[in-house]
């Protein structure tokens, strides 16, 4: 805590500018008006303040807004955002996507910090659901964001938002998460034709039940092996050799190379040897 000291004569800051970098911490505290700082926050980012000086500026804003900063200030925090604690951020009410983008930009290239996680949480709760524009923004900054949510949180994602999801956004999702997302994706893409539908639904198929896989096998989809191996084991096991052959098309040849991995191994053990022989791969059931 910086002691309250009078501002020396002639040192009172008429505006936020580069001259302030030469101020000592106590001078910043005494000579910079908090209300002026709040209205000229956009200038702070362009000035090479030290971390200690930023601490002082944050302290001034905290005093001015003990109940939490207004969005007009939050939007222009820039690198000062990195000084905020999750407790500070919980006091905020961020409603603008532009504000969210501005703050995510500050943390770009780094892993999701507790501050960012709190900010996103506040923003999404404020909106009531994870809409398409928000999801677009969040996955652009954090491709793993969707898979960091619990199945309960994912249940608030409306099917319309699924259009914003890219295949790489689902890379780290576990089966429980895909179980929630798959029905939403199925609903979102239901009006697409066969081949286009498969391209879109492919990344979500780790949540697909057996009957949907059987239906896909009738559509000449040629599912690649990497997708097949992400399917739920319990959904794959009831499939017949003929269905798997139709589902994978030319990629069925790769089963031989993956015969020791699940769900391939478990599926092979369920099949009759005569049926496996038709695959022409020398697989032993």
């Amino acid at each position: 805590e910086v002691e309250k000291t009078a501002c020396p004569s002639g040192k009172k800051a008429p505006e936020i500018d580069e001259s302030l970098i030469f101020y000592k911490k106590w001078e910043l505290e005494a000579c910079v008006d908090a209300a002026l700082l709040a209205t000229q926050m956009d200038r702070v980012n362009a000035i090479p303040f030290t971390y200690e000086q930023l601490d002082v500026l944050k302290h001034k804003l905290d005093e001015l807004y003990p109940q939490g900063y207004p969005e007009s200030v939050i939007q222009h925090l820039g690198y000062l955002f990195l000084k905020m604690s999750p407790e500070d951020i919980r006091k905020w009410n961020v409603t603008s996507l532009e504000t969210l983008k501005a703050l995510l930009e500050v943390n770009k290239g780094h892993e999701m910090s507790p501050q960012v996680a709190t900010l996103i949480d506040r923003f999404v709760k404020g909106r009531g659901q994870l809409d398409k524009d928000t999801l677009d923004t969040l996955t652009a900054f954090y491709p793993g964001y969707l898979c960091s949510l619990s199945p309960e949180e994912l249940s608030s994602v409306p099917p319309s938002s699924i259009w914003a999801v890219r295949p790489q956004d689902l890379d780290t999702c576990d089966p429980r998460q895909l179980d929630v997302l798959y029905p939403k994706a199925r609903l979102a893409f239901q009006n697409m034709n066969g081949s286009e539908y498969f391209v879109k639904i492919q990344s979500f198929l780790g949540g697909a039940p057996t009957e949907d896989l059987k239906a896909l096998s009738q559509q000449n989809v040629s599912m690649d092996l990497a997708t097949f191996m992400k399917l739920r084991t319990d959904a794959v096991l009831p499939l017949t050799v003929a269905e798997v052959q139709k589902l994978l098309g030319p990629h069925v040849e790769g089963l031989k190379a993956e015969e020791r991995h699940r769900p391939v191994r478990d599926w092979i053990l369920r099949q009759r040897q005569d049926d496996l022989d038709t695959l022409g791969l020398g697989l032993q059931g």
Partner: antibody, heavy 115, light 113 residues
């Protein structure tokens, strides 16, 4: 040792067809798929398609769908590729190759299309 | 279709030198479930058929000398010949078997001084 034997050369006239053979030996013919690959001088390698010798199922590169027809004769452990409506663009070396990794390649057949 | 890009297109080296050639794919070839990359390297000596050197990006085919080393994951792959021998004069191709149609790189021609 495992071998895929192909005839050395085929000289054919434009518009005609040719049936290339690939005779497998020293392995279970029905336990590996057979692939066919085209190589033109200075043009790299192109995958034409594959066939499952066990049931005759075929898969083609879209580019060769109306050009190549793959078949097998299990009794002689031989894979065939018929090329139709030949033009000078079809002049190339054609290889058969075994299995998912193409772990064994045929000796190659040079097809020359010329009047 | 997955596009495979090899570089350089040609290389000239002396016997005993280390050689590195690159292969890049337009999409990831990694099967995250088995942690295998569906990429193979082939050697084609003048007037001969191609021969499998490496599969799954880094698994050496039996009988291939251990100076041939494959590495990489996702979209970027490398074939290293740790100490080039005169008999390594050849074209080297990479190929993806992640999805059909199977596609090959344009090749790297290795010439030896």
């Amino acid at each position: 040792q495992v071998q895929l034997q192909q005839p050395g050369t085929e000289l054919v006239k434009p518009g005609a067809s040719v049936k290339l053979s690939c005779k497998a030996s020293d392995y279970t013919f029905t336990s590996y798929w057979m692939h066919w690959v085209k190589q033109r001088p200075g043009q790299g390698l192109e995958w034409i398609g594959s066939i499952n010798p066990s049931n005759g199922d075929t898969y083609y590169n879209e580019k060769f769908k109306n050009k190549a027809t793959l078949t097998v004769d299990k009794s002689s452990s031989t894979a065939y590729m018929q090329l139709s409506s030949l033009t000078s663009d079809d002049s190339a070396v054609y290889y058969c190759a075994r299995g998912w990794y193409f772990d064994v390649w045929g000796t190659g057949t040079t097809v020359t299309v010329s009047s | 279709d997955i596009v495979m890009t090899q570089s350089p297109s040609s290389l000239t080296v002396s016997v005993g030198q280390k050689v590195t050639m690159s292969c890049k794919s337009s999409q990831s070839l990694l099967n995250s479930s088995s942690q295998k990359n569906y990429l193979a390297w082939y050697q084609q000596k003048p007037g001969q058929s191609p021969k499998l050197l490496v599969y799954f990006a880094s698994t050496r085919e039996s009988g291939v000398p251990d100076r041939f080393i494959g590495s990489g994951s996702g979209t970027d792959f490398t074939l290293i010949i740790s100490s080039v021998q005169a008999e390594d004069l050849a074209d080297y191709f990479c190929q993806q078997h992640y999805s059909t149609p199977r596609t090959f790189g344009g090749g790297t021609k290795l010439e030896i001084i």
